[in-house]
């Protein structure tokens, strides 16, 4: 597992030619797991879906998400998360035409089929945390992060900067 340092190197190289906030700087396929190494599996049908957070069986293939990296049009106030002083934002797609969305009213993480340009609810500020972990902060609701609650993905409000390292909002990205 790794954080986004490798991605940052790549995005720096592409930085000058990218169009801020419109096209992704780069896209990357990775499996998503929790701080405790539980896998995130996306069970989608046409009319329904379920997102499993669970220990994956040894012989099973991990699901992958397509992470599309964008530069925030607003300068980052924090160091280490962005490229050239700007925040990195990501969208997460487990399959073609479907993206993770933040439903702030229900405090839930949902999968929606939609066309580009994606709504703001599909964008998450990417934070590079300790132990090669990342966290995903809602663009539409600063201080609210994708997290794990009762073996499901949910939106979790983080009250203070010390709580940014709480395990239930930390995720690992892996190529395998």
């Amino acid at each position: 597992a790794f954080g986004i340092s490798g991605v940052q190197k790549y995005t720096r190289a592409l930085h000058d030619s990218s169009i801020t906030g419109i096209s992704p700087i780069t896209e990357y396929l990775a499996s998503l797991s929790t701080y405790n190494d539980q896998s995130i599996t996306f069970a989608l049908e046409d009319e329904s879906y379920e997102i499993y957070v669970e220990d994956l069986k040894k012989d099973e293939k991990k699901d992958k998400v397509l992470l599309s990296y964008y530069e925030s049009q607003h300068p980052s106030n924090e160091s280490g998360d962005g490229v050239d002083g700007k925040m990195l934002m990501v969208t997460l797609s487990p399959t073609k035409d479907f993206w993770l969305h933040a439903n702030n009213k229900e405090h839930s993480v949902e999968l929606h089929k939609c066309e580009k340009p994606l709504p703001d609810q599909a964008f998450f500020v990417l934070h590079n945390m300790h132990s090669n972990c990342v966290s995903f902060e809602c663009k539409t609701d600063p201080g609210v992060f994708i997290g794990v609650k009762d073996n499901h993905l949910a939106l979790i409000k983080v009250d203070s900067s010390e709580n940014l390292c709480t395990e239930n909002i930390l995720f690992k990205l892996s190529e395998t």
Epitope: A43, L44, E45, K61, K64, P94
Partner: antibody, heavy 126, light 106 residues
Framework: EVQLLESGGGLVQPGGSLRLSCAAS????????MSWVRQAPGKGLEWVSG????????YYADPVKGRFTISRDNSKNTLYLQMNSLRAEDTAVYYC???????????????????WGQGTMVTVSS | SYVLTQPPSVSVSPGQTASITCSGE??????AAWYQQKPGQSPVLVIY???KRPSGIPERFSGSNSGNTATLTISGTQAMDEADYYC?????????FGGGTKVTVL
């Protein structure tokens, strides 16, 4: 409602060829991996072949490798199985089956088979 | 090639519990599925991911999987449950089925 309708079965001589079709409706066909499963008379189920994306991800059981070709036409919502060099042991009802879940970027099949067609009978005999 | 072994037949009285086993090497490391097939009909998925039931499948169908054996349990078996049952797994993008078990409701 998910519907899978197989066609193209029939009687063929050993060494001959057949092309099976499976017309899909009631779901976004291009989003799902598909398979063919067969059942010889009075016998159990045998997975034959599967396909994820258009042509990049195809999978075959050992007994049919090199003889059968699976393909799909997403614009027609149709799955195909081209069967060449047919043998008596290929005699079976051939079912078209859809993976339960949509394909994931990890690729490959997404077992299990959630929906099945009614089957089409293939008889290989002289 | 990977082999799944099922008993050829299981008999059960109405209202009783029927258990069908499916054995394979390190079966518990894979997700098992179970299919019901009635005479002259296509198979129907009744259990997937070891324990989960698709919508429309009665609660009397349940599954478990650990070690080298997956088990399908039919509680309060009804006459309509008389059918062939097949277990299955996916191994490296290859489907594998057990030989099938005929469940007879006496």
């Amino acid at each position: 409602e998910v519907q899978l309708l197989e066609s193209g079965g029939g009687l063929v001589q050993p060494g001959g060829s057949l092309r099976l079709s499976c017309a899909a409706s009631g779901f976004t066909f291009s989003s799902y991996a598909m398979s063919w499963v067969r059942q010889a008379p009075g016998k159990g189920l045998e997975w034959v072949s599967g396909i994820a994306d258009d042509f990049t991800s195809t999978y075959y059981a050992d007994p049919v490798k090199g003889r059968f070709t699976i393909s799909r036409d997403n614009s027609k919502n149709t799955l195909y199985l081209q069967m060449n060099s047919l043998r008596a042991e290929d005699t079976a009802v051939y079912y078209c089956a859809r993976d339960l879940w949509m394909m994931n970027y990890a690729g490959g099949l997404r077992y299990p088979f959630g929906y099945w067609g009614q089957g089409t009978m293939v008889t290989v005999s002289s | 090639s990977y082999v799944l072994t099922q008993p050829p037949s299981v008999s059960v009285s109405p209202g009783q519990t029927a258990s069908i086993t499916c054995s394979g090497e390190r079966m518990g490391d894979k997700y098992a599925a179970w299919y019901q097939q009635k005479p002259g009909q296509s198979p129907v998925l009744v259990i997937y991911r070891d324990t989960k039931r698709p919508s429309g499948i009665p609660e009397r169908f349940s599954g478990s999987n650990s070690g080298n054996t997956a088990t399908l349990t039919i509680s309060g078996t009804q006459a309509m449950d008389e059918a062939d049952y097949y277990c299955g797994v996916l191994k490296q993008d290859t489907g594998v089925f057990g030989g099938g078990t005929k469940v007879t409701v006496l």
